[in-house]
Amino acid sequence: TPLGPKWPEPVFGRLASPGFPGEYANDQERRWTLTAPPGYRLRLYFTHFDLELSHLCEYDFVKLSSGAKVLATLCGQESTDTERAPGKDTFYSLGSSLDITFRSDYSNEKPFTGFEAFYAAEDIDECQVAPGEAPTCDHHCHNHLGGFYCSCRAGYVLHRNKRTCSALCSGQVFTQRSGELSSPEYPRPYPKLSSCTYSISLEEGFSVILDFVESFDVETHPETLCPYDFLKIQTDREEHGPFCGKTLPHRIETKSNTVTITFVTDESGDHTGWKIHYTSTAQPCPYPMAPPNGHVSPVQAKYILKDSFSIFCETGYELLQGHLPLKSFTAVCQKDGSWDRPMPACSIVDCGPPDDLPSGRVEYITGPGVTTYKAVIQYSCEETFYTMKVNDGKYVCEADGFWTSSKGEKSLPVCEPVCGLSARTTGGRIYGGQKAKPGDFPWQVLILGGTTAAGALLYDNWVLTAAHAVYEQKHDASALDIRMGTLKRLSPHYTQAWSEAVFIHEGYTHDAGFDNDIALIKLNNKVVINSNITPICLPRKEAESFMRTDDIGTASGWGLTQRGFLARNLMYVDIPIVDHQKCTAAYEKPPYPRGSVTANMLCAGLESGGKDSCRGDSGGALVFLDSETERWFVGGIVSWGSMNCGEAGQYGVYTKVINYIPWIENIISDF
């Protein structure tokens, strides 16, 4: 029997009946065995076919078989109902070998020319399977010349049988307090030859509850308990299962915080698997009862391990643990069923006793000593001598625990001294130096420190004076002895004040004229204002209208009198303002240098002399009455004059205060 070529030779060729293309003889039998390489098959087709036709091809025939299977028995020239001729058909071996048998019987009614066929090896596409047949590979099939290989989707690994995809379904750890887990691909059929391990691992104190949901379908056996595929549940206390079949297992209350679920499958079957919804529970904590005037959030039916609640107080109430304030409060339920901290109180906000108001008082409006939320107090300043600055003095205890004004201020109001009050009323005429009476010049300050000088009280902690009067003490402010509230220079009854700092105008040059002869003394404490101690006002912008030529100002002090001694009693003199040009001219004659009188000075006195300030009065105020406000203000500071006080044709020269308002305001606001 002729054999066809064998692999590894090239597998292709031609076959023909004996004597082809001539007629074939009777009683012939010829057999060809063709063999292709592994992974290949043989393809065969006829280019000529002419055999005797007989019922079921019993006489002459060509038979094609592959292994034990007959692929075709062929005869005739064209197919009939019961016989088959190849026509244009192509025949394929089932494996890598193909047997071709030609036979002719003892006679032919007429001559037949037989057949001619061509064959070739071709790659088998193992990935192509007939409908109804099991697929070659579980997931992906890849054909190549001479063979194929299988691969798997992500999450699977190829089994050692090289065709099955086993699920990579181990090592998943669930740590949430509830969740779902299921067999791979659920609700589609689960993979074969897989071993899955799932862990639920919760914090100590939790207990896992397992509920099987939706459907349960795991391959089973009628007699043996889960021999093929099975599901097992293991805790540190006990094992549940194995489970298989189609019935949903009952709820499992594990009483454990750790659970291991094992699912094992074999190589066969087509089942949808399972789905578990797990929850957890723990020993509940006592139900939190909100404190009065507070509420709990969130509200839950019960609170278990790790659950928490916060307390929020109503407006006007605050969280307190005893006397200690808390901005927020959150308690967490512990594994032993207790809260990690005790419940605070929501106490009504208490703003506490209001601060004392210097030079003022406070009145409880809501009720005596009531300082809690929404309570009202009223600050007021001591009448006559103080006035309230900025607000109306009404404060409310707000939810933040601070007394707050109607303008939203949390700071105290300020009682500012009333300035420019005097017991004295001025007349229009000029008369000689007079003794001052109590309350006439309550701003008058006596400055002792090397020499005797004067000053005027501003606000309740500043003194306005002349630079030349305190120049020597500018670096030793504490050396200044400052007295006020007295008329008698040598009286032991006075209010003592001490200097904290001396501010001399930066434009003042000592012993080189008296331009910018102005200074401020900051007192180290505020003085109490009364009828004998009251500040002088600073001039308003409009003050120039009360300081024109011939307007009357009043100078006061303990300076030299006509007798040549310092006055024992405070003296004052009413003097008119002198025309500036006239004054300038008066001091242009020797011994005075040109330019002695500057625009920062004003002059006052009589042309005839006799009324003047003198040594010892330096730094004191030349004051004027503002007829609109009915308050006295400082227009000048006693600065310099002729060597002989009260000399005819000479005048007292005063620092013009209105030129220095910005300087004064800056110093006071900065310090």
């Epitope: 643990q321 005893g322 808390l326």
Partner: antibody
Framework: DVQLQESGPGLVKPSQSLSLTCTVT?????????WNWIRQFPGNKLEWMGY???????SYNPSLKSRISITRDTSKNQFFLHLNSVTTEDTATYFC?????????WGQGTPLTVSS | DIVMTQSQKFMSTSVGDRVSVTCKAS??????VAWYQQKPGQSPKALIY???YRYSGVPDRFTGSGSGTDFTLTISNVQSEDLAEYFC?????????FGAGTKLELK
């Protein structure tokens, strides 16, 4: 990590004023709780002086109310103790501490001697 | 002012013993009491707050109990590092006050 650190002069003369600073790191003094000054006298007796709360409100020991003031600088996360008219009786180690529910931290303390 | 009385200035103990430090308030302070441990040259360290709640990091051999006026700090299985002074502290009302301290020492 919450840390408190006191700083101050160490020695003060009688009748003078005392100022101490507590610098806080690791937590904002405006976030929560009460920020306290506590002192420990020789012999280990502890005395609470007062606190300034997260909101800036103060509470003082009535025995010191006329002399004490507690303030803060939120930009520097510091709070301060001011004590006027000190006497030798104020000689102690001064601690700043935050006291609150489940939140308790103390500084190392700064010794103060009042002596002429 | 609420006076916190620690009647025992000193207590002698041995390693492994159980010891109870007591504190009595002059008036009701609810459970607003803390316990502190202080070692020489160190600042006080909080052990217990609100009478019975242990601060994290504090060994569970320290337990606090009581409410109202009577409070106890119990140390079971005393260790050598527990030898220190213990203060009770009420934070119920102004002024906050401390006990005078109880010194734990070895027998």
């Amino acid at each position: 990590d919450v840390q408190l650190q006191e700083s101050g002069p160490g020695l003060v003369k009688p009748s003078q004023s005392l100022s101490l600073t507590c610098t806080v790191t690791g937590y904002s003094i405006t976030s929560d709780y009460a920020w306290n000054w506590i002192r420990q006298f020789p012999g280990n007796k502890l005395e609470w002086m007062g606190y300034i709360s997260y909101s800036g409100r103060t509470s003082y020991n009535p025995s010191l109310k006329s002399r004490i003031s507690i303030t803060r600088d939120t930009s520097k996360n510091q709070f301060f103790l001011h004590l006027n008219s000190v006497t030798t009786e104020d000689t102690a180690t001064y601690f700043c501490a935050v006291l609150g529910l489940y939140f308790d931290y103390w500084g190392q303390g700064t010794p103060l001697t009042v002596s002429s | 002012d609420i006076v916190m009385t620690q009647s025992q200035k000193f207590m002698s103990t041995s390693v492994g013993d159980r010891v109870s430090v007591t504190c009595k308030a002059s008036q009701n302070v609810d459970t607003n009491v803390a316990w502190y441990q202080q070692k020489p040259g160190q600042s006080p360290k909080a052990l217990i707050y609100s009478a019975s709640y242990r601060y994290s990091g504090v060994p569970d051999r320290f337990t606090g109990s009581g409410s109202g006026t009577d409070f106890t700090l119990t140390i079971s299985n005393v260790q050598s590092e527990d030898l220190a002074e213990y203060f009770c502290h009420q934070f119920n009302s102004n002024p906050l006050t401390f006990g005078a301290g109880t010194k734990l020492e070895l027998k």
